[in-house]
Interface confidence: medium
C-alpha cells in the first residue's frame, strides 16, 4: 500500500517536519490517490490487454466519467477558481460510484483499492472545507448510483475488465488536471 | 527510447514570427498526465522557461511573454509547434523543447537544442 | 509571480570537496522542485525531482534537501565531470527557473 500522507514514499530524512498547510495537504493527498492508481493500472495492465485495447468506446458508452474541460475554469486560460472547485468538488463526487465499483475487482491490490476509496474521501472533506460556494456542489442522486452500480456489474467479463482500465484511466486524468489546477489556487 | 529534435529556422527578421516545431518519439502526447515544455537560453544567460501544452490541450504561458507565444500539438504526428510573434534581438537563444510526464513535473528528457538568431 | 532566488551565483571547489547550492523561492512550492545540470553547449539534465528524489542513473553523491521556501542541493565530493551550472526550477503554476551556479574546479 502507498505511504499515507505526509510520510514520503521513498528513503529520505525529514527531520523536524512542519505540519501540514491546507494546500499541502491536498497537493500530497492527490499525489497519494495517484500513487494508488497507478499500482491499481499495473495489475489492470498485467491481467489483459485492456491497456493497448483499441476497443475503449465500446465500453466508453456506459460510463459517464467526470471530464474536465475549458468551461470548467480549470484550465490556465480562463482559469476561474471558484467554478474550477466546484468542478473539482463534483467531480470527485461523481466518481465516488466508480470507485465502488473497483472495490471487488482486484485480487493482489484489493487494499490499495479501498486506500484510494478512503483517501478520496479524505481529499473531498479537504476540499469542502476550501469550497466558499458550496451551495453549487451537486451531491449523486444515491438511487441513481444504486441503479448505474448494479448495470455495471452486471456486463460481461471483457466489458468489465475495460470498465476497470476506463475508471482508473479517466480518475488518473481528472486528478493530475485538479492537482495543476489546485496549484493555482 | 525517449528522443526530441527542435527543428526551425536559424535566423528571423526582427519582428517576424518565430515558429518551431518539437518532434518527439518514444512516448505519447495522447497519455494522460504527458506534457511537452519550451525553454530558451540566450548566449551565456541563464534558462527561461516559455510555455508548455499538457496531453488534453491544456496550456500554460510564462507570463512575461503570454501575448507573444502559442503552443500547439498534433499528437498524430507526435509534434509540437510554438510560435513567438514581434521577434527582436533579445529573442536570439537556442530554444530546447522537453519532456515532463506525470506529477513529479521534472523535465525529464531534452532535445539538443536549436540555435535561433534574430538579426536584421 | 513566484521567483526563484539561487546562491551562489558561481563557486570555485577542489575535487573531493563537498559543494552546497542554495535556492529559495519567493512563497510556498512545498516539494515541488527540480535540480538541472548543464554542461557547455549541451541541453540540462534532470537530477533531482520533487526535492529530493534522484533521477533515473544519477550518482548518488547528488542530493536534495528542503520543502517548502529554502531547498538545498549537495554534491557530497565533487568530481571533475561535475563542472557544470546547476539550475533550479519549481513546478507550482508556471515554473521559471533560477539564475544559476557555475560550479568550477580550483
Known amino acids: 500500500a502507498p505511504v499515507p500522507p505526509g510520510e514520503d514514499s521513498k528513503d529520505v530524512a525529514a527531520p523536524h517536519r512542519q505540519p501540514l498547510t491546507s494546500s499541502e495537504r491536498i497537493d500530497k493527498q492527490i499525489r497519494y490517490i495517484l500513487d494508488g492508481i497507478s499500482a491499481l493500472r499495473k495489475e489492470t495492465c498485467n491481467k489483459s490487454n485492456m491497456c493497448e485495447s483499441s476497443k475503449e468506446a465500446l465500453a466508453e458508452n456506459n460510463l459517464n466519467l467526470p471530464k474536465m474541460a475549458e468551461k470548467d475554469g480549470c484550465f490556465q486560460s480562463g482559469f476561474n477558481e471558484e467554478t474550477c472547485l466546484v468542478k473539482i468538488i463534483t467531480g470527485l463526487l461523481e466518481f465516488e460510484v466508480y470507485l465502488e465499483y473497483l472495490q471487488n475487482r482486484f485480487e493482489s491490490s484489493e487494499e490499495q483499492a479501498r486506500a484510494v476509496q478512503m483517501s478520496t474521501k479524505v481529499l473531498i472533506q479537504f476540499l469542502q472545507k476550501k469550497a466558499k460556494n458550496l451551495d453549487a456542489i451537486t451531491t449523486p442522486d444515491p438511487t441513481t448510483n444504486a441503479s448505474l452500480l448494479t448495470k455495471l456489474q452486471a456486463q460481461n467479463q471483457w466489458l468489465q475488465d475495460m470498465t476497470t482500465h476506463l475508471i482508473l484511466r479517466s480518475f488518473k486524468e481528472f486528478l493530475q488536471s485538479s492537482l495543476r489546477a489546485l496549484r493555482q489556487m | 527510447q525517449v528522443t526530441l529534435r527542435e527543428s526551425g529556422p536559424a535566423l528571423v527578421r526582427p519582428t517576424q514570427t518565430l515558429t518551431l516545431t518539437c518532434t518527439f518519439s518514444?512516448?505519447?502526447?495522447?497519455?494522460?498526465?504527458?506534457?511537452v515544455g519550451w525553454i530558451r537560453q540566450p548566449p551565456g544567460e541563464a534558462l527561461e522557461w516559455l510555455a508548455h501544452?499538457?496531453?488534453?490541450?491544456?496550456?500554460y504561458y510564462n507570463p512575461a511573454l503570454k501575448g507573444r507565444l502559442a503552443v500547439s500539438k498534433d499528437t498524430s504526428k507526435n509534434q509540437v509547434v510554438l510560435s513567438m510573434n514581434t521577434v527582436g534581438p533579445g529573442d536570439t537563444a537556442t530554444y530546447y523543447c522537453?519532456?515532463?510526464?506525470?506529477?513529479?513535473?521534472?523535465?525529464?528528457?531534452w532535445g539538443q537544442g536549436i540555435l535561433v538568431t534574430v538579426s536584421s | 509571480d513566484i521567483q526563484m532566488t539561487q546562491s551562489p551565483s558561481s563557486l570555485s571547489a577542489s575535487v573531493g570537496d563537498r559543494v552546497t547550492i542554495t535556492c529559495r523561492a519567493s512563497?510556498?512550492?512545498?516539494?515541488?522542485l527540480a535540480w538541472y545540470q548543464q554542461k557547455p553547449g549541451k541541453a540540462p539534465k534532470l537530477l533531482i525531482y520533487?526535492?529530493?528524489y534522484l533521477a533515473d542513473g544519477v550518482p548518488s553523491r547528488f542530493s536534495g534537501s528542503g520543502s517548502g521556501t529554502d531547498f538545498t542541493f549537495t554534491i557530497s565530493s565533487l568530481q571533475p565531470e561535475d563542472i557544470a551550472t546547476y539550475y533550479c526550477q519549481h513546478f507550482w503554476g508556471t515554473p521559471p527557473f533560477g539564475q544559476g551556479t557555475k560550479v568550477e574546479i580550483k
Open positions: 501544452i499538457w496531453w488534453n490541450d491544456d496550456k
Open positions: 512563497e510556498n512550492i512545498y516539494s515541488n
Open positions: 520533487a526535492a529530493t
Open positions: 522537453a519532456r515532463m510526464e506525470d506529477y513529479d513535473e521534472a523535465m525529464d528528457y
Open positions: 518514444g512516448f505519447s502526447l495522447s497519455t494522460s498526465g504527458m506534457t
